[in-house]
Amino acid sequence: AANKRKNQNRNKSSSHQDSSRMSSVGDYNTSEQKQACKKHELYVSFRDLGWQDWIIAPEGYAAFYCDGECSFPLNAHMNATNHAIVQTLVHLMFPDHVPKPCCAPTKLNAISVLYFDDSSNVILKKYRNMVVRSCGCH
Amino acid sequence: AANKRKNQNRNKSSSHQDSSRMSSVGDYNTSEQKQACKKHELYVSFRDLGWQDWIIAPEGYAAFYCDGECSFPLNAHMNATNHAIVQTLVHLMFPDHVPKPCCAPTKLNAISVLYFDDSSNVILKKYRNMVVRSCGCH
């Protein structure tokens, strides 16, 4: 995840200019003590990505994202791999050598998108791994 | 990944006391401009984890770990999911709302471990997801 910044007052509206219509997305790094790895709300507007000229439908989708700390001890909710558990222990002993595991999607879902291809044909395609179903420490 | 720290002189030997015998592991965050997401060397000694009393063999194993930036544009080497590509674009536009994707294992291998169980029986067990085979942006 990105570096931590100082807390700022970011009371977002759902207007297009403001925040990609990312309803109920707070600042992902508002305090020095980050919360544990979990799934967060994120609505992605294809217009805001500049894809509105080729994507017909949907207008956007609930993508979600993963963020948070993967700190010792990793509990069951964190869907940690064996490697992540080992890496957490190594980080605990040698914090300057190895980072903590990172909070990443463990399960992703597909969405269907209707779009114009390069030849202006309308294509209905299923795009894999577009929506976060669950997050874990990896 | 963890926060960046100031560069320190850490010329590690492979001795056990010093660095968990993490041969050729440099500081994972030595400069403000992190390198791109990739696989790094990491040897894990079960002794250093305090597991020497119940693990008979091996003494340790090459676990590797993933670290580095997942910045725009994500190239083919970064094994990025569709969601990671979308998240990178959203982060580019709204850096305070959503973190960059994180560098995490995309493929993991198992190792076999010989150990004593609670009844002092010797067990040979295959532990899944112990060794990083490849890293990617998630």
Epitope: A57, P58, E59, S112, F116, S120, N121, V122 | -
Partner: antibody
Framework: QVQLQESGPGLVKPSETLSLTCTVS????????WSWIRQPPGKGLEWIGY???????HYNPSLKSRVTISVDTSKNQFSLKMSSVTAADTAVYYC???????????????WGQGTLVTVSS | EIVLTQSPGTLSLSPGERATLSCRAS???????LAWYQQKPGQAPRLLIY???SRATGIPDRFSGSGSGTDFTLTISRLEPEDFAVYYC?????????FGGGTKVEIK
């Protein structure tokens, strides 16, 4: 139920700009694609272009250089402007709705009743 | 662009007869993205069929659509007096969206 009503001048001089407005009632314009189609007297139908309520547009390449479609969500209206008109642009101009979901994109339903625009000096 | 050719140009039939209208595309219409409309004099077109074969809401079951690829058909199983009109096909599988030239179904 949703109804569409075209309005604008019935007579436009050659080389001037044709301006029409479609008012949508019975439904919010804040979904769907909104389209313009024309039909010269005694001839077939020609799609002009469409707009999404958030402003993205798609035009028929044959008319693209002369056409602008815009939307006013506060008035539940969308508009057509066609510049440099000639007698060949004389037609009945229809506005129509296109569904904007994956399962129902691309056909026109419903239509406005149409308005005849004559280009003549 | 995809050119749609409708045939025949005019179909002269009596009430109660079966009408078969053809729409041929210059290239394949993806996913059967084809619609049919009915237009009566002085009125706007009305959607009959979408997706090549799905009837629009309120359309009688004597109207049916079929076909895929480049060849599509609209069938009216038994012509009623109110069915005499001009029929247009429209493809939305490629941009620009295009219409056929129309088939006029007239009373014999």
């Amino acid at each position: 139920q949703v109804q569409l009503q075209e309005s604008g001048p019935g007579l436009v001089k050659p080389s001037e700009t044709l301006s029409l407005t479609c008012t949508v009632s019975g439904d919010s314009i804040r979904s769907y694609y909104w389209s313009w189609i024309r039909q010269p007297p005694g001839k077939g139908l020609e799609w002009i272009g469409y707009i999404y309520y958030r402003g993205s547009t798609h035009y028929n390449p044959s008319l693209k250089s002369r056409v602008t479609i815009s939307v006013d969500t506060s008035k539940n209206q969308f508009s057509l402007k066609m510049s440099s008109v000639t007698a060949a642009d004389t037609a009945v101009y229809y506005c129509a709705r296109i569904c904007s979901s994956i399962s129902c994109w691309g056909w026109f339903d419903p239509w406005g009743q149409g308005t005849l625009v004559t280009v003549s000096s | 662009e995809i050119v749609l050719t409708q045939s025949p140009g005019t179909l002269s039939l009596s009430p109660g007869e079966r009408a078969t209208l053809s729409c041929r595309a210059s290239q394949s219409v993806s996913s059967s993205y084809l619609a049919w409309y009915q237009q009566k004099p002085g009125q706007a077109p009305r959607l009959l069929i979408y997706g090549a074969s799905s009837r629009a809401t309120g359309i009688p079951d004597r109207f049916s659509g079929s076909g895929s690829g480049t060849d599509f058909t609209l069938t009216i199983s038994r012509l009623e007096p109110e069915d005499f009109a001009v029929y247009y096909c429209q493809q939305y599988g490629s941009s620009p969206l295009t219409f056929g030239g129309g088939t006029k179904v007239e009373i014999k």
